[in-house]
């Protein structure tokens, strides 16, 4: 926390991750102050001259905003009085990664806190039975990842087994030349078993499960952000 002036207020931030091309939120909260006109919120980014965003006297003031954030930022204006200084960030870019400072001034005092913002790409995998293959196989696809992730397969029946010899993973660059499509095929699968395709980089971990029986195919997928 940075302390200046006679009083300091508690400002809290949370490390978070942004998905390239999507919208993100940089979270920041502070001790509420019912006097909206007396609240100043400034977001700054390490290594960038100018501001990321400024909100004061009940409205935005972007006269000092750095051009890389032009048209991409907003606070949740109706939530400022209850202590929410979080920043909405439109169309997250790889270059948005870095250390941000949320600086607050209210009638009660001043305070600030830093947060680390990671950027990359992550998406849910989808597993399907590949009927075109010569033997029963599973195809795990996830449309957008960056940096390049690792892909691993697991099975409920063969716990601890290494499937690297019976799987093939490829990475195809997407049209924007940053993110990549992940495709992994697992060969020689057996019926009545649950298989998992796990995709992970330093930002996120995603898992897709598929259970194949004689009568049905059940799928489930989940995604979790790491270190946030």
């Amino acid at each position: 926390f940075g302390i200046s002036g006679k009083h300091f207020i508690t400002v809290t931030t949370f490390t978070s991750a942004g998905n390239i091309g999507e919208d993100g939120t940089l979270s920041c909260t502070f001790e509420p102050d019912i006097k909206l006109n007396g609240i100043v919120i400034q977001w700054l980014k390490e290594g960038i001259k100018g501001l990321v965003h400024e909100f004061k006297e009940g409205k935005d003031d972007l006269s000092q905003q750095h051009e890389m954030f032009r048209g991409r930022t907003a606070v949740f204006a109706d939530q400022v009085v209850v202590g929410n200084a979080s920043l909405r960030l439109k169309n997250v870019q790889l270059t948005d990664a870095g250390t941000y400072t949320c600086y607050i001034r209210t009638s009660k005092g001043k305070g600030n806190a830093n947060l680390e913002y990671k950027t990359g790409a992550f998406s849910m995998p989808e597993i399907n039975v590949d009927y075109n293959a010569s033997s029963e196989s599973l195809r795990c696809e996830a449309p957008r990842w960056f940096p390049q992730p690792t892909v691993a397969w697991a099975s409920q029946v063969d716990q601890g087994a290494n499937f690297s010899e019976v799987s093939n993973t490829s990475f195809e660059l997407n049209s924007e030349n940053v993110t990549m499509k992940v495709v992994s095929v697992l060969y020689n699968v057996t019926i009545n078993n649950t298989y998992s395709c796990m995709i992970e980089n330093d930002i996120a971990k995603a898992t897709g499960d598929i259970k194949v029986t004689d009568s049905e195919v059940k799928r489930r997928s989940q995604l979790q952000l790491l270190n946030s």
């Epitope: 091309g21 999507e22 919208d23 409205k59 935005d60 003031d61 972007l62 006269s63 000092q64 905003q65 051009e67 032009r70 048209g71 991409r72 930022t73 907003a74 909405r88 439109k90 169309n91 049209s175 924007e176």
Partner: antibody
């Protein structure tokens, strides 16, 4: 409520500079929550975003027109302006000024009536 | 630049009809899409923002949906005053770009 009105010559000669002004009434363009844009529409055609300006004077121009466009703002007169240099017949269009609905939304919730500018000798 | 492709370019319909216009972005734009209505000799009017949010004062027969690359504007029951040209616009990435327009004509 805020209204926008474009003004400027309706006829410009080729190679000269097109100059338009947008005057706001019923509200202030110094409100920090908005960007102010210029958009044009060629006769019978679609819409083209030219660029925007903030009350502080910072600008962003469409790269396709960037070399020829200059925008400025005069908060004391509650006006913002567009200059487009080295015009050709292809710049003949209805020119609109508009307000972006917030600092992040980039949709246009308020428009001027538009002014037809013809480029001809 | 992000290309916005509207279809159809024109549609003939009658009062009371349900009309659907689609807009496709050349790359993902999340939900940053607006729809406008323009009548001859007039400025465009904002109908829908953020893909599905109805602009204040716009009748509820207008609705928008979609995210990513594919979006739809629906007029649930066409009224005489709805005959106009409709444009989509992406608000995701500079430079902001518009679709080519869809003219809704009287059948």
């Amino acid at each position: 409520q805020l209204q926008l009105q474009e003004s400027g010559p309706g006829l410009v000669k080729p190679s000269e500079t097109l100059s338009l002004t947008c005057t706001a009434s019923g509200g202030s363009i110094s409100h920090g929550g908005y960007y102010w844009s210029w958009i044009r529409q060629h006769p019978g055609k679609g819409l083209e975003w030219i660029g925007n300006i903030y009350y502080s004077g910072s600008t962003y121009y469409n790269p396709s027109l960037k070399s020829r466009v200059t925008m400025s703002v005069d908060t004391s007169k509650n006006q913002f302006s567009l200059k487009l240099s080295s015009v050709t017949a292809a710049d003949t269009a209805v020119y609109y000024c508009a307000r972006e609905s917030s600092t992040i939304s980039a949709d246009f919730d308020l428009w001027g009536r538009g002014t037809l500018v013809t480029v001809s000798s | 630049d992000i290309q916005m492709t509207q279809s159809p370019s024109s549609v003939s319909a009658s009062v009371g009809d349900r009309v659907t216009i689609t807009c496709r972005a050349s790359q993902g734009i999340s939900r940053w899409l607006a729809w406008y209505q323009q009548k001859p000799g007039k400025a465009p009017k904002l109908l829908i923002y953020a893909a599905s949010s109805l602009q204040s004062g716009v009748p509820s027969r207008f609705s928008g949906s979609g995210s990513g690359t594919d979006f739809t504007l629906t007029i649930s029951s066409l009224q005489p005053e709805d005959f106009a040209t409709y444009y989509c616009q992406q608000a995701h990435t500079f430079p902001y770009t518009f679709g080519g327009g869809t003219k809704v004509e009287i059948k």
